[in-house]
């Protein structure tokens, strides 16, 4: 239904707190360099204006679109060109081009310092002094670093943050209460960020239909008792919500997400028997809970998939007359039978099925041509299963850090032209799949591993797009989203790469490494490992292990030495020489 004033409508629907949070996220995601105070001022102005529109929907400018209102605010910021360069050119455009322009200037890798967590006492003090401002800072800092973060989920994480601080700041030992809890939230939020970025990539590169297919597969796995019409309705609504968030329409997105949660809770009987616990929660927790609710029990009496999709006489007719419905039904039926498959795999199977029908249906005897299609799925299923087994075995043998190193070597060999920081970040993230997924029950491993890897590789593609350097990466990134992971897995050593010259300074370390937190130490060592591979792309695993063990021993010895500086300056060059010899 059309509203006289869109901004008043959203303010009323969302309430002041969520309205302000979402506007702050929107501004922080568009203008990623502005300070919190600059954005907070704009948010207050927008909120005050929204209130005037609530009081009188006919007041001046209240009928303007949200894009117009927000865009005008952003374009009125002083020194826009000095701070943002060509993004300022967006302000010469009219809506909807202006908003499209802002979206195109979102930076997935902004040059901002890492978000450092203050120490416990300081955090609790500023939280107690002004919880609203404290939370505002959190939203701002996360949103500007993650310009596609799913806004309603970010509000949920802020609420989690708030609850943790409220609880832990009352404890005697604040630090030991806060650290593990906040680390947990941070880890979950980072995963949420890469997953959502993948959804936006799907939407941006391949359109709504691609995202809707993803949603149908995912929802069918989770709600196998819901019928196709119900799954289609949920997928359509979920597509709209994600399209809005990916498009910067955060107020609409949050509002529609709340509506979807409401609908699901009012229609549990036709959706799933597992929703009640989620539905008892308040809004943000409810929506979050629904998004990761456990799979419902599969119906016991499902017929074989072949009946409708291979044996039926009307297969080709049904395909040709309504591909969206017929292939959507195939995806639904296959997915609800396979909660143990990744969404990426299910989409590959649906694509294979579609390609087979497209090839066969015009032939003289179509059933003879497409009759073996389900058997032809086997290699497509075996490939990711083998990937999971191989990688989880390796993870169990090496542990997370060792597993990350193995992946780092592998990916540096595949794409040695990629910058070392990007390779290290990717390998560390890819390596976390072990901890995240390999400990799960067998039937949950494959969906966990492959869908997580796909999201991480999407980030690799986004970073590479900014400065393309590797033909291997370009090849894998320019194909369809669901083919990316298999493409990367299939890459071998890049034979076109000319090895980097050995530079002693790259492998020269100083005593300051000893005081670094463990994570930073690991990154330093992994940076050296990537550089070694770039110097010797064909070095064997044994050679690299020898060098890295020697390196670890060197750090251990010098960090324990009474005179660390002398140890580093005398033993360092010896280490470099030994490294060169070991790799010769």
């Amino acid at each position: 239904e059309a509203h006289k004033s869109e901004i008043a409508h959203r303010y009323n629907d969302l309430g002041e707190q969520h309205f302000k949070g979402l506007v702050l996220i929107a501004f922080s995601q568009y203008l990623q360099k502005c300070s919190y105070d600059e954005h907070a001022k704009l948010v207050q102005e927008v909120t005050d204006f929204a209130k005037t529109c609530v009081a009188d929907e006919s007041a001046a400018n209240c009928d303007k679109s949200l894009h117009t209102l927000f865009g005008d605010k952003l374009c009125a910021i002083p020194n826009l060109r000095e701070n943002y360069g060509e993004l300022a050119d967006c302000c010469t455009k009219q809506e909807p081009e202006r908003n499209e322009c802002f979206l195109q200037h979102k930076d997935d890798n902004p040059s901002l310092p890492p978000f450092e967590r203050p120490e416990a006492e300081a955090m609790c003090t500023s939280f107690k002094e002004n919880p609203t401002t404290f939370m505002g800072h959190y939203l701002h800092e996360v949103a500007r670093r993650h310009p596609y973060f799913y806004a309603p989920e970010l509000l949920y994480y802020a609420e989690q943050y708030n609850e943790i601080l409220t609880q832990c700041c009352a404890e005697a030992d604040k630090e030991s209460c806060l650290t593990p809890k906040l680390d947990g939230v941070k880890e979950k939020a980072l995963v949420s960020s890469v997953r959502q970025r993948m959804k936006c990539s799907s939407m941006q590169k391949f359109g709504e239909r691609a995202f809707k297919a993803w949603a149908v597969a995912r929802l069918s796995q989770t709600f196998p008792n819901a019928d196709f019409a119900e799954i289609t309705k949920l997928a359509t609504d979920l597509t709209k919500v994600n399209k809005e968030c990916c498009h910067g329409d955060l107020l609409e997105c949050a509002d529609d997400r709340a509506e979807l949660a409401k609908y699901m809770c009012e229609n549990q009987a036709t959706i799933s028997s597992k929703l009640q616990t989620c539905c008892d929660k308040p809004l943000l927790k409810k929506a979050h809970c629904l998004s990761e609710v456990e799979h419902d029990t599969m119906p016991a009496d499902l017929p074989a998939i072949a009946a409708d999709f291979v044996e039926d006489q009307e297969v080709c007719k049904n395909y040709a007359e309504a591909k969206d419905v017929f292939l959507g039904t195939f995806l639904y039926e296959y997915s609800r039978r396979h909660p143990d498959y990744s969404v990426s795999l299910l989409l590959r199977l649906a694509k294979k099925y579609e390609a087979t029908l497209e090839k066969c249906c015009a032939e003289a005897n179509p059933p003879a041509c497409y009759g073996t299609v389900l058997a032809e799925f086997q290699p497509l299923v075996e490939e990711p299963k083998n990937l999971v087994k191989t990688n989880c075995d390796l993870y169990e043998k090496l542990g997370e850090y060792g597993f990350q190193n193995a992946i780092l070597v592998r990916y540096t060999q595949k794409a040695p032209q990629v910058s070392t920081p990007t390779l290290v970040e990717a390998a560390r993230n890819l390596g976390r799949v072990g901890t995240k997924c390999c400990t799960l029950p067998e039937d949950q491993r494959l969906p966990c591993v492959e869908d997580y890897l796909s999201a991480i590789l999407n980030r690799v593609c986004l970073l590479h797009e900014k400065t393309p350097v590797s033909e291997h990466v370009t090849k894998c990134c320019s194909g369809s989203l669901v083919e990316r992971r298999p493409c990367f897995s299939a890459l071998t050593v890049d034979e076109t790469y000319v090895p980097k010259e050995f530079k002693a300074e790259t492998f020269t370390f100083h005593s300051d490494i000893c005081t670094l937190p463990e994570k930073e130490k690991q990154i330093k060592k992994q940076t050296a490992l990537a550089e070694l591979v770039k110097h010797k792309p064909k070095a064997t695993a044994e050679q690299l292990k020898t060098v890295m063990d020697d390196f670890a021993q060197f750090l251990d010895t010098c960090c324990k030495a009474a005179d660390k500086d002398t140890c580093f300056s005398t033993e360092g060059p010896n280490l470099v020489t030994r490294c060169k010899d070991a790799l010769a």
Partner: antibody, heavy 121, light 110 residues
Framework: EVQLLESGGGLVQPGGSLRLSCAVS????????INWVRQAPGKGLEWIGI???????FYATWAKGRFTISRDNSKNTVYLQMNSLRAEDTAVYYC???????????????WGQGTLVTVSS | DIQMTQSPSSVSASVGDRVTITCQSS???????LSWYQQKPGKAPKLLIY???KLTSGVPSRFSGSGSGTDFTLTISSLQPEDFATYYC???????????FGGGTKVEIK
Amino acid sequence: EVQLLESGGGLVQPGGSLRLSCAVSGIDLSNYAINWVRQAPGKGLEWIGIIWASGTTFYATWAKGRFTISRDNSKNTVYLQMNSLRAEDTAVYYCARTVPGYSTAPYFDLWGQGTLVTVSS
Amino acid sequence: DIQMTQSPSSVSASVGDRVTITCQSSPSVWSNFLSWYQQKPGKAPKLLIYEASKLTSGVPSRFSGSGSGTDFTLTISSLQPEDFATYYCGGGYSSISDTTFGGGTKVEIK
């Protein structure tokens, strides 16, 4: 050399019927899908329908009911039966083969030279 | 209703020019089912490009296609005398019955 050759065009009165033929030489028609496409004088292309190798047919929404496609593999010929013809059906009618390996895609790699149908009183 | 809009409807260009023709579809075509045809007066159309960007064998490499979803482009990088003709895009959709051609773009000698 593969050739598609349309015939059967000519002048027909409004409300009349006409059957066009598309004779195929150089390939065995029984393995291919054939489309009919028309082009009114000075206008663009308009897809009419398709017949798959199996004999299954599909039509553009506007063509359903008045137009029927059939085939006789023994004669290596596809037909377009047109009924209740109107002045706006005046056009050059082409038959065209769908690229092998596709069934529903608009990829037509071999075309006949076309036959003109004029509907006028 | 299916809409396949080609623009411009005609373009005047000289030999050696770069020519770009666009085709906008509503709704989006199915699975990049988009083709480009060239038609010369009194002749049947000729398939140039299929799957939005794949060149039919024998078609010169100066022809290229790009795009996905709803927006597609045919580019002739350096127009040759034999390229003066009318160009059509063709789209396939969820239902085969919706197969449609664009209105055509006539490339004329300037």
